[in-house]
Interface confidence: low
């Protein structure tokens, strides 16, 4: 049976399409191509006489068509108006005509889209934001990406307008993006430049650092306050309810027992109009809250050099303390291979080398007292045997 196949079926505007013919009968006088689903002399594109190998343009010929001896039709520089059906009529030598209809679809090469927004500076937990992907084009699929990932399933995310509009209900500070929209049709795809949201939020409850409560007389008291906020919060300090200063940091040199009391940090966001406070008790005393002796443990105490790694862990039940590490009376880390993690509670050495053998201990301390662990010995061995394949390492 006579058939046609469009190559490709979906064509980009300005490109070319080949209407291929399959199962063309052997004994032929000629054939004609028509625009549409039926034979219509008014819509003939071209006729071809086999005997003379002569092609004759028809009324629907645009000058962009080329017919080949195998009956295939090439259409160049296609436009969206070329979309549709094409019918081939074959006149056989037995005068029985055969017909076959094919089709293709022309799609535009899509432009780079852009994102418009109804609110670029929303307030957290209050405002909604609607993004719209421009331009609006026919036969186009609209996709959205947040942080380079397809949209997560969330009741706060709504698609509308044929997926061209993305609405964020009740934005949060984590909704900054970036947001991208992608437009697709069967022949092209294009993604917008990223757009980010400036979400106004906060302040959250402030945190006063350091966490220490106890200080010795004569020490310097340096407190810092931080509250997550956009735009950044404005800070002020009160001591025992009395305003002191409008700064993020409070510094009092050479403190005395009279500086004991309640220290309040006040954080304000002028855009959201919200305020948050945190109170911290400071005790200035000669008495020493004793820090307990920490415990030190090793993932292994005998390791193979240049191969193994080891983790040393310093454990303490005390709070508000800091930890530091020592090796052969030197503070650590002392090389790129040594890493501290989990608030300095873990010392990792990767890989272990010969010079890492020896005694390690940790020390916990607060502004008032400190205590050391018992030492632990790390042994480093080296394999004397050659590798199985006989090749030297490295």
């Amino acid at each position: 049976q006579l058939t046609t196949e469009s190559m490709p079926f979906n064509v980009a505007e300005g490109k070319e399409v080949l209407l291929l013919v399959h199962n063309l009968p052997q004994q032929l006088f000629g054939y004609s191509w028509y625009k549409g689903e039926r034979v219509d002399g008014n819509r003939q594109i071209v006729g071809y006489a086999i005997g003379t190998q002569q092609a004759t343009p028809g009324p629907a010929n645009s000058g962009r068509e080329t017919i080949y001896p195998n009956a295939s039709l090439l259409i160049q520089n296609v436009t969206q108006n070329d979309t549709g059906f094409y019918t081939l009529q074959v006149i056989k030598s037995d005068l029985v005509n055969e017909e076959a209809t094919g089709q293709f679809h022309v799609y535009p090469e899509l432009p780079k889209p852009s994102i418009s927004s109804n609110n670029s500076n929303p307030v957290e937990d209050k405002d909604a934001v609607a993004f719209t992907c421009e331009p609006e084009t026919q036969d186009t699929t609209y996709l959205w990406w947040i942080n380079n990932q397809s949209l997560p399933v969330s009741p706060r995310l709504q698609l509308s307008n044929g997926n061209r509009t993305l609405t964020l209900l009740s934005v949060t500070r984590n909704d900054t993006g970036p947001y991208e929209c992608e437009i697709q049709n069967p022949v092209s795809a294009n993604r917008s430049d990223p757009v980010t949201l400036n979400v106004t939020y906060g302040p959250d409850t402030p945190t006063i650092s350091p966490s220490d409560t106890y200080y010795r007389p004569g020490a310097n008291l340096s407190l810092s306050c931080y509250a997550a906020s956009n735009p950044p919060a404005q800070y002020s300090w009160l001591i025992n309810g009395t305003f002191q200063q409008s700064t993020q940091e409070l510094f009092i040199p050479n403190i005395t027992v009279n500086n004991s009391g309640s220290y309040t940090c006040h954080a304000n966001n002028s855009v959201t109009g919200c305020n948050r406070t945190t109170v911290k008790t400071i005790i200035v005393t000669e008495l020493s809250p004793v820090v307990a002796k920490p415990q030190i443990k090793a993932s292994k105490t005998t390791v193979t050099g240049d191969k193994d790694s080891v983790n040393l862990t310093c454990s303490t039940n005390d709070t508000g303390i800091s930890i530091r590490w020592f090796f052969k009376n030197q503070s650590l880390p002392s090389s790129e291979r040594m890493k501290l993690s989990q608030g300095n509670t873990t010392l990792s050495i990767n890989p272990v080398k010969r010079e890492d053998a020896g005694t390690y201990w940790c020390e916990v301390f607060n502004p008032i007292s400190k205590n050391q662990s018992d030492p632990i010995m790390l042994n480093v061995n080296y394999n004397a045997l050659p590798q199985e394949n006989g090749l030297s390492p490295g």
Epitope: E5, S6, M7, P8, F9, L18, N148, Q149, S150, P186
Partner: antibody
Framework: EVQLLESGGGLVQPGGSLRLSCAAS????????MSWVRQAPGKGLEWVSV????????YYADSVKGRLTISRDNSKNTLYLQMNSLRAEDTAVYYC??????????????WGQGTLVTVSS | QSVLTQPPSASGTPGQRVTISCSGS????????VSWYQQLPGTAPKLLIY???RRPSGVPDRFSGSKSGTSASLAISGLRSEDEADYYC???????????FGGGTKLTVL
């Protein structure tokens, strides 16, 4: 349920020929581009050839051009690979695989169980 | 020598997160979508990720894909013993007019 079943593998001498078939079921075969992918023993995957859903577009890996020919019969829901002038390096398990994207984002979502072709004297 | 470059091996312990990289060029990863396949011993490959980061239905969300420039990565979180397999990346190559695979990465669950 989508199924792809390869057949036609076996032992063949260097220079010989073989024709592999892949019978498809559980989906509209004529709507999908199809590929052959091979895997030499103990080695990685190597794409061999692809044919469009209508059979009009065909591509081959450089290593098989002129020796292997892909074809399809949509009426029989079958994909073929004609293998000529076979070499020892053609020894592999041959998988047929379906591309659900019509080539817009080429990928293979269903694979057959594979058929082993051994080229040896 | 594969057109796409993967590390030959990777390992992790159960529950861990492991990432496998795939490096290519502008003619493949840079301008085409990337897929990831899992091949368990003695079985046919299985599609894990297509179009850079999309998961077919039935693939656990422990598997995720990403792409940046001419490189792509497969991340497996909450590693399980049944994840021990060979993993391949793949993409269409505009210069070769063909599909290319990475050399494969053997993942061992310790």
């Amino acid at each position: 349920e989508v199924q792809l079943l390869e057949s036609g593998g076996g032992l063949v001498q260097p220079g010989g020929s073989l024709r592999l078939s892949c019978a498809a079921s559980g989906f509209t075969f004529s709507n999908y581009a199809m590929s052959w992918v091979r895997q030499a023993p103990g080695k990685g995957l190597e794409w061999v050839s692809v044919i469009s859903h209508g059979g009009g577009s065909i591509y081959y890996a450089d290593s098989v051009k002129g020796r292997l020919t892909i074809s399809r019969d949509n009426s029989k829901n079958t994909l073929y690979l004609q293998m000529n002038s076979l070499r020892a390096e053609d020894t592999a398990v041959y998988y047929c695989a379906r591309d659900p994207t019509k080539g817009y984002a080429p990928t293979f979502d269903y694979w057959g169980q594979g058929t082993l072709v051994t080229v040896s004297s | 020598q594969s057109v796409l470059t993967q590390p030959p091996s990777a390992s992790g312990t159960p529950g861990q997160r492991v990432t496998i990289s795939c490096s290519g060029s502008s003619s493949n990863i840079g301008n085409n979508y990337v897929s990831w396949y899992q091949q368990l011993p003695g079985t046919a490959p299985k599609l894990l990720i297509y179009a850079d980061s999309r998961r077919p239905s039935g693939v656990p969300d422990r598997f995720s894909g990403s792409k940046s420039g001419t490189s792509a990565s497969l991340a497996i979180s909450g590693l399980r013993s049944e994840d021990e397999a060979d993993y391949y990346c793949g993409a269409w190559d505009l210069s070769l007019n063909g599909y290319v695979f990475g050399g494969g990465t053997k993942l061992t669950v310790l």
